[in-house]
Amino acid sequence: SSPCPQAWGPPGVQYGQPGRSVKLCCPGVTAGDPVSWFRDGEPKLLQGPDSGLGHELVLAQADSTDEGTYICQTLDGALGGTVTLQLGYPPARPVVSCQAADYENFSCTWSPSQISGLPTRYLTSYRKKTVLGADSQRRSPSTGPWPCPQDPLGAARCVVHGAEFWSQYRINVTEVNPLGASTRLLDVSLQSILRPDPPQGLRVESVPGYPRRLRASWTYPASWPCQPHFLLKFRLQYRPAQHPAWSTVEPAGLEEVITDAVAGLPHAVRVSARDFLDAGTWSTWSPEAWGTPSTGTIPKEIPAWGQLHTQPEVEPQVDSPAPPRPSLQPHPRLLDHRDSVEQVAVLA
């Protein structure tokens, strides 16, 4: 058997670090057998069999000119093997970050903090950490580790499925190359890394007969679980075209009626989502949707109650506003205490 331990990486390649002493090992001989060393394609003897170093070649303070293929020969001139030297650096701890778009799964991505110049792979795993007792800061022995399955095709990402919202996890990403391994440990809780995807299907419609109104509606992001235990709350921003500043409101559901739009001007609207108990952070903004308030007047006939687009208003009771209702279902919110000024203007 070969006296040379096979480092992780392609066969026949041995590794060293620039500026350090490097030992090359002749693979096809018995340990300690004296050999001669040559550079491939060069007749000059690098190290003879009388060096006292047996089957090894020592290169002091290796640099890039030492990279390449070496040949070792036994005393009788037989080929002991060929070795390719590649120089690089041991792994440095990778940089790791984790994010969650819902409360059941999270993903972690990593980048090398320093390029080693050598073949590199990553080992990814996680443990669940649990607290002992409600008022205790001590942690029980963690459970796991379990592998964090990596994306195919070499994307630097792994995903933990079926995570528990209230648990803490310790992520282990280890960078491995032929010169060693280096580990980054990252403690994450789903609550702190939760950032929903932006709401989808944003639509902005005029409200016929109301020249200062726009109705915006949207849906939950597709990535949010279909039957959620946790709801989302929303933040909506709108502004007239060419106006630099956004106005912000926090709707109670999946719809909002804007009552102070500028008549005749198109308005940009966008919406963002967050866990309704304020875990994590707000999503990025949805793509903007545009709408222009109606230019018409109130129709003479009062339509059926269900036809919300043209429903005229009744003076709302300002002293008893509806409680906020996080809801999966869109619910009409035409009436609002902010409406009274416009109502006077329209109905006068």
């Epitope: 650096y89 440095a92 701890r93 940089v95 980048s111 090398p112 903090s113 320093q114 390029i115």
Partner: antibody, heavy 118, light 107 residues
Framework: EVQLLESGGGLVQPGGSLRLSCAAS????????MTWVRQAPGKGLEWVSS????????QYADSVKGRFTISRDNSKNTLYLQMNSLRAEDTAVYYC???????????WGRGTLVTVSS | DIQMTQSPSSLSASVGDRVTITCQAS??????LNWYQQKPGKAPKLLIY???NLQTGVPSRFSGSGSGTDFTFTISSLQPEDIATYYC?????????FGPGTKVDIK
């Protein structure tokens, strides 16, 4: 020999913007994480921001998050710090520093002075 | 963020004296600690990395020790050129932090 040369500092009014550059030479720039560290007059050192070799991960001190952006151009061996909404407390000498790895600063530039004042 | 404290904040010693500075982290940082020297008007210079390793070219009178939360930096025999401010710095997590510094001068 590793060399890091910062530029782009100067006097700017509160609320203004500035872009710092760090020209690197003497090493394979695209292999290393890079960092900005600052030092207010008469004060200690404060880490500002770091970026991995690929640019794919960045990190910021809370004091500059949302206002400063770190970036790099590996083809030009240059590190950048875009500073917006500047405040008086951002007045400092800004140093560019390199790894190895993340958060360990083995080589430093000479620094460039940023003064935020009206 | 991990907080770093250093003591003393300043000290005066005679040439040839042994000088010791301590650094404490608010949580375990393993051995992910560096020590830097900064002279007035100059950039910082790395002296010690990974808590106890002497950077190439740094005189052997400088040394470091410790692990976890408590670390020590020592100048075995203070020289006039050692007048400077010394900083510890952790890099255990992704947001590195520096200690407030210790100013060293000659009596």
């Amino acid at each position: 020999e590793v060399q890091l040369l910062e530029s782009g500092g100067g006097l700017v009014q509160p609320g203004g913007s500035l872009r710092l550059s760090c020209a690197a030479s003497g090493f394979t720039f695209s292999w290393y994480s890079m960092t900005w560290v600052r030092q207010a007059p008469g004060k200690g050192l404060e880490w500002v921001s770091s970026i991995v070799p690929s640019g794919g991960h960045t990190q910021y001190a809370d004091s500059v998050k949302g206002r400063f952006t770190i970036s790099r151009d590996n083809s030009k061996n240059t590190l950048y710090l875009q500073m917006n909404s500047l405040r008086a407390e951002d007045t400092a000498v800004y140093y560019c520093a390199k790894g190895p790895g993340w958060g360990s600063f083995w080589q430093w530039g000479r620094g460039t002075l940023v003064t935020v004042s009206s | 963020d991990i907080q770093m404290t250093q003591s003393p904040s300043s000290l005066s010693a005679s040439v040839g004296d042994r000088v010791t500075i301590t650094c404490q982290a608010s949580q375990d940082i393993n051995n992910y600690l560096n020590w830097y020297q900064q002279k007035p008007g100059k950039a910082p210079k790395l002296l010690i990395y990974d808590a106890s390793n002497l950077q190439t070219g740094v005189p052997s009178r400088f040394s470091g020790s410790g692990s976890g939360t408590d670390f020590t930096f020592t100048i075995s025999s203070l020289q006039p050129e050692d007048i400077a401010t010394y900083y510890c710095q952790q890099y255990d997590n992704l947001s590195p932090t520096f200690g407030p510094g210790t100013k060293v001068d000659i009596k």
